[in-house]
Interface confidence: medium
């Protein structure tokens, strides 16, 4: 299945001299990503990232998804994608619409994870998963 709608985004990985991420954060395309080793519900994951001055990751390009999947270590991670039941659509936490494919959809699965599979997977918001946080590189 096609995960993303077709896009002309031809991003490549660049690392500018002097651009840094905090210890244990991963750098990609001027952003820093933190893959937690602990787990919690989606709401607590959102707060966890907020406490680190970041947000749950917005994985809105195929390149970003591939980068993160390459480092997710055979685990599932919450990302900043939630299902708005009243609109019947998935939105990123910055409110942009996600028109791609989410597998494992279920009326009780209103949050999403990546890792383990090559797709975005719907998941219960109340079950504990690891989480990916994202913020600007300095």
């Amino acid at each position: 299945p096609q995960i993303f709608n077709k896009s002309n985004d031809g991003f490549t990985t660049t690392r500018s001299y002097g651009t840094v991420c905090p210890k244990d954060w991963e750098f990609y395309q001027a952003r820093c990503f933190f893959l937690s080793t602990s787990e919690s519900s989606w709401n607590e994951s959102r707060d966890f990232c907020k406490g680190k001055g970041s947000t749950l990751a917005i994985v809105n390009t195929p390149e970003k998804l591939k980068f993160l999947q390459d480092i997710t270590d055979a685990e599932k991670y919450f990302i900043g994608l939630i299902y708005h039941r009243e609109e019947k659509r998935w939105r990123w936490i910055n409110n942009s619409v996600f028109n791609g494919n989410v597998t494992n959809q279920n009326q009780n699965f209103n949050c999403a994870t990546i890792g383990l599979t090559k797709t975005f997977d719907a998941a219960s918001c109340d079950i504990s998963y690891r989480r990916i946080c994202e913020k600007n590189a300095k």
Partner: antibody
């Protein structure tokens, strides 16, 4: 590979105490949890809380929140700080490692220390 | 918080027989059936027997078998030997946002 707890003592009600768990033959892995479990004399096991080594996140049993604090002090030691101790806290305190099994994160405590006895009495 | 209820609290079993210990969770354990079983002998720390419901820990004999899902779990010990005399505990993991782990009350197995 082994774990050893230290710091157990006889203390008075209301006192504070810090227990240390030291690993020998290995360093804590980023993906593992270090946890504390206690056992009152002649009673069952009671889970206290865990620390995720990789990101420092801690979580606790509801009765332990605010009074017990788990911290990582080095790549081979964690502590359990206990405050406002009462006679009900008298127990053997165990530290245990919970590896994050790939793909499921299952909490099987695969390595335990022998325990250290804490007695709270006036 | 999740509550784990073990039955029976004590069981006497002849050498060579099979013993079954039940563990019921007050709510479904977290994903992938995160239920573990431990064996504890007097004066010793617990020893991991089984994790994620049915996976045998390293070095544990295949006489020990874990099964179940959701809220009902079972530990079965077949061909019981004297060395199996111990207290057995189940432990369930519900997730960090719901007070984490909880142990059952224990089942003492006496081998006749």
């Amino acid at each position: 590979q082994s774990l050893e707890e230290s710091g157990g003592d006889l203390v008075k009600p209301g006192a504070s105490l810090t227990l240390t768990c030291t690993a020998s033959g290995f360093s804590f892995s980023r993906s593992s949890y270090m946890c504390w479990v206690r056992q009152a004399p002649g009673k069952g096991l009671e889970w206290i809380g865990c620390l995720s080594v990789g990101d420092g996140h801690t979580y606790y049993a509801s009765w332990a929140k605010g009074r017990f604090t788990i911290s990582k002090t080095s790549s081979t030691s964690v502590t359990l700080q206990m405050t406002r101790l009462t006679a009900a806290d008298t127990a053997t305190y165990f530290c245990a490692r919970a590896p994050s099994y790939s793909g499921d994160g299952g909490h099987g405590y695969d390595l335990w220390g022998p325990g250290t006895l804490v007695t709270v009495s006036s | 918080a999740i509550v784990m209820t073990q039955t029976p609290s004590s069981k006497s079993v002849p050498v060579g027989d099979t013993v079954t210990i039940n563990c019921q969770a007050s709510e479904s354990v977290d994903r992938n059936n995160r239920l573990a079983w431990f064996q504890q002998k007097p004066g010793q720390p617990p020893k991991l027997l089984i994790y994620t419901t049915s996976t045998l820990a390293s070095g544990v004999p295949s006489r020990f078998k874990g099964s179940g899902s959701g809220t009902h779990f079972t530990l079965t010990i077949s061909d019981v030997v004297p060395d199996d005399a111990a207290t057995y505990y189940c432990a369930g993991y519900r997730g960090a946002h719901t007070d984490g782990d909880a142990f059952g009350g224990g089942t003492e197995v006496v081998v006749k």
